[in-house]
Interface confidence: medium
């Protein structure tokens, strides 16, 4: 029988070199064996490229489209084929569907006496438009204290966050992760970075602890 697309391909771009398209088929499908997603930049002399999809669950497929780079006016035609059968035809403008890359190298510095300093890396090179447009959300939680989970919004450009160590409980471990979005490109949030763990050994000075104890 003929194959059918149940949920049309939806694509997001990292605005650098990869766009990811996901879709669902009408029944169990071996995506890499049975399907091909062809994509072509709408431009006078561009070539057609072929993406071999991977399975993403029983009926889901995902394809990673490689692009030399991305500029704001780019528009791609997309054709989903099953052998000689054209299942779906559409188009995709990367600049209108941006999901930033996840920040990397999240590091926690606890050697400053009363401050926990978190730093991470901007996932884009300086010549990319998103480089100076990213803002971040830092999620801090504790496995020892399930009630504790905070989101810190970092709306300045520098990929750092300072937290007074006194706002965290002493003697327990915390985890942090960070994600990004770009305001001017109306992007979705990136995936979370891998989390990093640290032990909060900070103890308030005796006077302050004594003061807290009596109030």
């Amino acid at each position: 029988g003929s194959m059918k697309v149940l949920q049309e391909p939806a694509c997001v771009s990292d605005y650098m070199s990869i766009s990811t398209c996901e879709w669902k088929m009408g029944g169990p499908t071996n995506c890499s064996a049975e399907l091909r997603l062809l994509y072509q930049l709408v431009f006078q002399s561009s070539e057609t490229h072929t993406c071999v999809p991977e399975n993403n669950g029983g009926v889901g497929c995902v394809c990673h489209l490689l692009m030399d780079d991305v500029v704001s006016m780019d528009n791609y035609t997309l054709d989903l084929w099953a052998g000689q059968q054209l299942l779906w035809k559409g188009s995709f403008k990367p600049s209108e569907h941006v999901k930033p890359r996840a920040p990397g190298n999240l590091t926690v510095h606890t050697n400053v006496s009363d401050t926990v300093l978190l730093t991470w890396s901007n996932p884009y090179p300086p010549d990319n438009y998103l480089y100076n447009d990213l803002t971040y959300a830092v999620n801090i939680w504790s496995e020892n204290d399930p009630a504790y989970s905070r989101i810190h919004n970092v709306t300045y450009l520098k990929p750092t966050l300072r937290i007074p160590a006194s706002t965290l409980k002493s003697g327990i471990s915390y985890r942090a992760r960070v994600r990004a979005w770009a305001q001017h490109y109306n992007t979705t949030w990136s995936e979370w970075s891998p989390s990093t763990k640290w032990y909060n050994s900070y103890r308030e000075p005796f006077e302050q602890r004594h003061h807290h104890h009596h109030h």
Epitope: L41, F43, Q44, S45, E47, D68, V71, S72, M73, N75
Partner: antibody, heavy 120, light 106 residues
């Protein structure tokens, strides 16, 4: 570092054929890009003449189509321009340039140009 | 073919001044490129796909536009910017260039 170098006769008589060579170093002409010929007339007007792509396909400016040919020698990493039945209007500086196909029509690499005079 | 008209033909500016030159196309184009050319040299890629600065181009340069109207702006002109600037399209064959805007310093 990609470099392009034009070479040619400098002076051609009217009605004769013009042959120019572009030697590319630092990049294989079969790897990527369109390899173009562009000329600049004495008044500085630039005109795209045509290209041969990395795959060997070619495209020409319709205004020159009847008398232009662009070919290549992949073993020498060179491409060539032949322009037939030249007139004094073909007097110009001739540039070879690489780019175009995947760069949304931008010419990334240019030779330094060779001046051609058509005169009897 | 798509004809590109650049204006002004000659632009005279004082150092530190902001200048804008325009390129108009007879039909809509998707990408517009700009080149800088100095006497005795070949054109250099300057702005790629409307607004992206080529490698090594100072940040005082910017490009914008869409459809049939594009522009190149220099926020604060410097002596080294003295050159002729050409726009170029490849939305249709033949690829075409504008006639150029010559930037001079007062």
């Amino acid at each position: 570092d990609v470099q392009l170098q034009e070479s040619g006769p400098g002076l051609v008589k009217p009605s004769q054929s013009l042959s120019l060579t572009c030697t590319v170093t630092g990049y294989s002409i079969t790897s990527d890009y369109a390899w173009n010929w562009i000329r600049q007339f004495p008044g500085n007007k630039l005109e795209w003449m045509g290209y041969i792509s990395y795959s060997g396909s070619s495209s020409y400016n319709p205004s020159l189509k009847s008398r232009i040919s662009i070919t290549r020698d992949t073993s020498k990493n060179q491409f060539f321009l032949q322009l037939n039945s030249v007139t004094t209007d073909d007097t110009a500086t001739y540039y070879c340039a690489g780019g175009g196909l995947r760069r949304r029509g931008l010419f990334d690499y240019w030779g330094q140009g060779t001046t051609l005079t058509v005169s009897s | 073919q798509i004809v590109l008209s650049q204006s002004p033909a000659i632009l005279s500016a004082s150092p530190g001044e902001k200048v804008t030159m325009t390129c108009r196309a007879t039909s809509s184009v998707t990408y517009m490129h700009w080149y800088q050319q100095k006497p005795g040299s070949s054109p250099k890629p300057w702005i790629y796909a409307t607004s992206n600065l080529a490698s090594g181009v100072p940040a005082r340069f910017s490009g914008s536009g869409s459809g049939t109207s594009y522009s190149l702006t220099i926020s604060r002109v410097e002596a080294e910017d003295t050159a002729t600037y050409y726009c170029q399209q490849w939305s249709s064959i033949p690829l075409t260039f504008g006639a150029g805007t010559k930037l001079e310093l007062k």
